[in-house]
């Protein structure tokens, strides 16, 4: 107690009434209006509470303070009077703030600010949407991934800021009349091969694929070491030469020199060199056969093996090289009588005739090309008179039926001696190497030495044996007719051919000629 009669124990936020009582300060309240014990407290009255009589008015908020309250304008509003706080509705001068005018960059890029009562909203430009985590920020809509599929399937969607494009895929182009970019773009595959837009190496052939192309090795070529086939950067090398090497077990300097020349020609070979290369190979072969040198000292069987190897290899090499020639007819002849006739065409539906000094060949063009082969069609005929030296005394192997028939009907069968080669050896080839069973036969007309009377004339081909050598055979070849110095043969396959005179004593009327042929 103090002497003036005022209680000293009044709780916080209260004042004494007298020596024994206290009262809460304005803005505070206690359980009873008069406080008589120090245990009671004065608590702040929340004037802003719902049931309070305080009214700040519109566009404002009531803020409770310790022992009092303030009225303030709501966010987005400001007092016209300039007073930040007020106490009742009559003092309220709050009005809407136009944030858009106050801060033109409020919606950042790609949005338009729209003022609202007490606030504002951002309206995004077409192609943009509000970012969920920042509703004031407009971000690009990716039309390409939004599942809208706005582009035609022949195009690919390219998103860009605020928009998108429908662009032709690489290797495609707009169809006639279509734009390239808008959402109505429609595209079609570009044929890079026929339009010349490809980058294929000259050793390859261009193949169009959907939206792209690939480069495949030319027929008879293989990918260079370590480079895959069928790529845009495929580079190939000619296989033609790599496989034509001397036959195993034959030791001949002359033959080695010939094959050295072949390998030299193959080393830096390019498709554009085909014509010169063909001529050089035939020149070398012509020289080899004109002067066989130590080949003539080899045993007969080995000579036949060499001949077989030369004929087989020559056919492959010429086939491979001739596919690189341009269209037209070629004729080459050489001092020792070797002769080449070649016709190269994009396939045509007619028969072709190749004429040489000692032989004529006639066949249908449609035999020449393997289906699906993109290259030109080639028909070739080589006459190789010099091959006769190496094929001297080569055996003739008849089919069992023909053999039997001849034995039965020719009483004067001369068993001694091999058949005599009457004609030049010729070799026929096509770009198509599958020539074992022609759909229509090939006809050869041979000019040859005179036939000895009463001797059997046979149209034969050289059959390459399993042992790498070979023999003359007649299977699939028939003699259509023969005169003293010419014979017509018809065969259902291609190989190397000749006319032989067999040692049979033929009667004046030959009852088995028809059977033989």
């Amino acid at each position: 107690q103090d002497s003036r009669g005022c209680a000293r124990w009044c709780p916080q936020d209260s004042s004494c009434v007298n020596a024994t009582a206290c009262r809460c300060n304005p803005g505070f309240s206690s359980f009873s209006e008069i406080i008589t014990t120090p245990m009671e407290t004065c608590d702040d009255i929340n004037e802003c509470a719902t049931l309070s009589k305080v009214s700040c008015g519109k566009f404002s908020d009531c803020w409770n303070t310790e022992g009092s309250y303030d009225c303030v304008c709501s966010p987005g509003y400001e007092p016209v009077s300039g007073a930040k706080t007020f106490k009742n509705e009559s003092e309220n001068t709050c009005q809407d703030v136009d944030e858009c005018q106050q801060n033109p960059r409020l919606c950042k890029s790609y949005g338009t600010c729209v003022n609202t009562l007490g606030s504002y909203t951002c309206q995004c430009l077409p192609g943009f949407k509000l970012k969920p985590e920042d509703p004031k920020l407009c971000t690009d809509v990716n039309e390409c991934t939004s599942g809208q599929n706005p582009c035609h399937s022949s195009t690919h969607c390219l998103n860009n800021v605020g928009s998108y494009q429908c662009r032709c895929r690489p290797g495609w182009q707009p169809i006639p009349g279509s734009p390239n970019g808008p959402n109505n773009t429609v595209c079609e595959d570009v044929d890079e091969c026929s339009s010349g837009q490809h980058q294929c190496d000259s050793s390859t052939v261009c193949f169009n694929t959907v939206g792209s192309y690939s480069c495949r090795c030319r027929p008879g070529w293989k990918p260079r070491h370590g480079i895959p086939n069928n790529q845009k950067d495929t580079v190939c090398e000619d296989m033609t030469f790599s496989t034509w090497t001397p036959p195993p077990g034959v030791h001949s300097q002359t033959l080695s020199r010939f094959f050295d020349k072949v390998q030299d020609l193959g080393r830096d070979y390019k498709p554009g060199l085909a014509n010169n290369t063909i001529q050089s190979i035939l020149q070398a072969l012509d020289e080899l056969l004109e002067a066989p040198g130590d080949l003539e000292t080899l045993p007969r069987l080995q000579q036949h093996c060499v001949a077989s190897h030369l004929l087989d290899g020559l056919e492959d090499v010429l086939r491979g090289l001739s596919k690189n020639l341009s269209n037209g007819l070629l004729n080459f002849s050489y001092p020792a009588g070797t002769e080449l006739s070649l016709e190269v065409q994009k396939q045509v539906d007619r028969s072709v005739t190749l004429r040489q000094n000692q032989a004529v060949m006639q066949l249908d063009w449609n035999q020449a090309q393997k289906s699906g082969d993109p290259g030109p069609s080639v028909v070739g005929l080589v006459s190789i008179p010099g091959m006769g030296k190496l094929l001297a005394e080569a055996p003739l192997v008849l089919e069992p039926e023909k053999q039997m028939l001849l034995h039965e009907t020719h009483q004067g069968l001369l068993q001694d001696g091999s058949p005599i080669l009457l004609s030049d050896v010729i070799s026929a080839f096509l770009s198509n190497n599958d020539t074992q069973n022609l759909s229509s036969p090939v006809t050869f007309t041979f000019s040859h030495r005179s036939v000895i009377p009463r001797q059997k004339v046979l149209c034969v081909f050289w059959e390459h044996g399993q042992n790498g050598c070979g023999h003359w055979a007649t299977t699939g070849c028939s003699t259509i007719g023969t005169r003293d110095t010419s014979t017509i043969c018809r065969c259902t396959h291609l190989s190397s051919f000749a006319v032989l005179m067999a040692h049979y004593d033929v009667q004046e009327e030959d009852p088995v000629l028809t059977v033989i042929t």
């Epitope: 050793s203 390019k270 060199l273 050089s280």
Partner: antibody
């Protein structure tokens, strides 16, 4: 008739580069390799390399790899040789010649004289 | 590389005489060619593929040989034949020339 026309004489400073040209006419440019041959004053013939105009493939001697760059332009039937990092020993007459393995170098250009001098 | 050695380095002969020029290869060669060069001019092909006469070349020139030894023969020297002669091989890369044989008037 076959002709190989080479560009005119060049005088260059050490370290510089020169690009020589050889324009072919009278034959199919892609049917032969184009050879380049160097002949230093009073010396013999030295093969530099060759370019195949059909696909731009090249062959070089080891000595001229990185020194001589061979190219060909099919559209103008012209072969080019660029000689770089020139030194006095590059002073020579440079010939182009068309060539094929079996036929040798059957037609030659008239030669281009390159003089390297500071 | 294949080294070609020509001999002799110089051949002194009179017009009308026979000239025999040799070219020896360090390994076997399939395609050997011969060229003639006169001062200030480009070389010209004389013989290709060992023995074949190039276009426009008189038949007094002939070539022979095989393997590693090759010969160029001029049967009767004419005044215009005095020049430098080079052999050249095309059997392996790099292509190589012989160092040349000078045929001079005696």
């Amino acid at each position: 008739q076959v002709q190989l026309q080479q560009s005119g004489a060049e005088v260059a400073k050490p370290g510089a580069s020169v690009k020589l040209s050889c324009k072919a006419s009278g034959y199919t440019f892609t049917n032969y390799w184009m050879q380049w041959i160097k002949q230093a004053p009073g010396q013999g013939l030295e093969w530099i390399g060759a370019v195949y105009p059909g696909d731009g493939d090249t062959r070089h001697t080891q000595k001229f790899k990185g020194k001589a760059t061979l190219t060909a332009d099919k559209s103008t039937s012209t072969a080019y040789m660029e000689v770089s990092s020139l030194r006095s020993e590059d002073t020579a007459v440079y010939y182009c010649a068309r060539g094929f393995t079996a036929y040798g170098m059957d037609y030659w250009g008239q030669g281009t004289t390159v003089t390297v001098s500071s | 590389e294949i080294v070609l050695t020509q001999s002799p380095a110089t051949l002194s002969l009179s017009p009308g005489e026979r000239a025999t020029l040799s070219c020896s290869a360090s390994s076997s060669v399939s395609y050997m060619h011969w060229y003639q060069q006169k001062p200030g001019l480009a070389p010209r092909l004389l013989i290709y593929d060992t023995s074949k006469l190039a276009s426009g070349i008189p038949d007094r020139f002939s070539g022979s040989g095989s393997g590693t030894d090759f010969t160029l023969t001029i049967s009767r020297l004419e005044p215009e034949d005095f020049a430098v002669y080079y052999c050249q091989q095309w059997s392996s890369n790099p292509l190589t020339f012989g160092q040349g044989t000078k045929v001079e008037i005696k």
